[in-house]
């Protein structure tokens, strides 16, 4: 942009150098050149000479008018045609920007990833503003009334060392730019309720050579949280439909989960956990691929009526990927109950 230009005159913008996208804009150029009575004053936008909607106001001043200006940024400058000069003479230049006031930040979420030492808050910023927009995260203790504020662009990590005075907080986000300011809704946060257990990892899988082969998946986490609730989802690599098994886990030892699967098939497994009774899930673990062994006597395999599904799981649910290219985005289709109670109701955010 044109940040430091020696002007021989002035350039100004109405309604201002930063304005709402789609507004009508007038840009004025006033020359103060020595030894020049300009024949013409010219306007340039991004280096290209403008031809239309230019008005000569008086000997020294001209104006260009834009109807519904909708470019996020433009570099304007104006020149004078001085008698006896071969080249045009620069008068002045300005950066101009158009954009939108911010939307109120929405879907504010704060979590503490176990062992991170930070509370991470994220939010939806809404539609693009096209101009510099900052977010001020307010964290107010409900016990001491003290308020801390943090500047951010899209998310914030707040050291838990600075949250020592209290366990309960009110958090909200203020979006600010040159065209306006909006506040999110306030979020009540209890630090003990927002911890996400340390990442769960599937370490290995094996299929036994029994008459009815079973696959054992081994998985672990370094979490110190005692009561953890987990989901493992699995499907063949050719399938779009996931099955989901639920577990109460105790990570003082490696978890083993048994599955009766279709033989000679490549399966993908993923696991995620949350502190029991809390609402924040880990992201799904990295996909773990396992090939089941061949079976000599082939059978017709039906996962939903089959005796081969391990009965000790709490529930097995069926989930379908929206697109084969987006295996992380899942949509709940149905639930099949195996142990007398419905699926947990936490499936809407799978993926």
């Amino acid at each position: 942009g044109i940040t430091s230009i020696n002007c021989s005159g002035d350039m100004w913008v109405e309604p201002g150098e930063i304005f709402q996208m789609g507004m009508n804009v007038s840009i004025y150029c006033q020359e103060a050149l020595k030894h020049c009575r300009p024949r013409n004053l010219y306007f340039y936008k991004n280096g290209f000479k403008e031809e239309f909607d230019i008005t000569r106001i008086n000997r020294t001043t001209a104006r260009i008018w834009y109807k519904g200006f909708s470019e996020p940024h433009a570099y304007m400058h104006c020149t004078a045609e001085c008698p006896g000069h071969f080249q045009e003479t620069l008068i002045c230049g300005k950066d101009i920007s158009s954009g939108h006031p911010p939307d109120a930040p929405s879907n504010l979420t704060c979590v503490i990833y176990e062992y991170s030492g930070n509370m991470t808050c994220t939010w939806n910023t809404g539609k693009p503003t096209y101009i510099d927009t900052k977010y001020i995260v307010h964290v107010k203790s409900l016990e001491t009334e003290e308020e801390q504020q943090y500047l951010a662009s899209s998310y914030v990590k707040i050291s838990t060392d600075s949250l020592q005075g209290s366990r309960k907080y009110l958090v909200w986000v203020q979006a600010v730019n040159s065209l306006g300011m909006e506040n999110s809704q306030q979020l009540h946060v209890h630090l003990d309720d927002i911890v996400i257990p340390s990442a769960s990892i599937i370490s290995r899988a094996e299929t036994t050579n029994d008459t009815v082969p079973k696959t054992i998946v081994y998985w672990k986490s370094k979490t110190m949280i005692e009561k953890v609730f987990c989901e493992m989802r699995y499907k063949t690599t050719t399938n779009q439909t996931w099955s989901v098994k639920e577990f109460d886990a105790n990570f003082t030892y490696v978890q083993q989960s048994e599955f009766y699967l279709e033989p000679d098939s490549k399966y993908v497994f993923q696991v995620r956990c949350q502190e029991t009774g809390k609402r924040n899930w880990q992201p799904w673990s990295s996909p773990f691929v396992h090939q089941t062994s061949q079976e000599t006597g082939k059978r017709n395999w039906q996962p939903w009526s089959s005796p081969f599904v391990h009965q000790t799981s709490q529930t097995v649910s069926q989930v379908t990927a929206k697109s084969s290219h987006e295996p992380q985005k899942m949509e709940m289709l149905s639930a099949t109950i195996f142990r007398g109670h419905p699926a947990s109701g936490n499936h809407q955010d799978i993926g």
Partner: nanobody, 116 residues
């Protein structure tokens, strides 16, 4: 209780520089976001700049690229470096708690006068 005391103002020619200070006491300065606001003669209060506890900064468009806000937690002091001053920067300058807002809590302020 919270005490804020501004200093460093003065008279300067257009294009000149000044450094304003704000000495703070009565609260945990290192954990507190701060801001500068100003009031030009006959006008309302105008927010100028803010800084959070980690040093992230934000500026009004009118001062962006010319003013720099900073804080020294060891000295419990907030600063505002004013460069390339313009006549329209003439105002009483106040510091306050919080990153953003066009209010202050009754501190005395420091006068900046820029002449052409």
């Amino acid at each position: 209780q919270v005490q804020l005391q501004e200093s460093g103002g003065g008279s300067v020619q257009a294009g000149g520089s000044l450094r304003l200070s704000c000495a703070a006491s009565g609260f945990t300065f290192r954990l507190t976001a701060m801001r500068w606001v100003r009031q030009a003669p006959g006008k309302g209060l105008e927010w100028v700049s803010g800084i959070d506890s980690r040093g992230s900064t934000i500026y009004a468009d009118s001062v962006k690229g010319r003013f720099t806000i900073s804080k020294d937690n060891a000295k419990n002091t907030l600063y505002l470096q004013l460069n390339s001053l313009k006549t329209e920067d003439t105002a009483m300058y106040y510091c306050a708690q919080g990153v953003y807002g066009d209010t202050y809590s009754g501190s005395q302020g420091t006068q900046v006068t820029v002449s052409s």
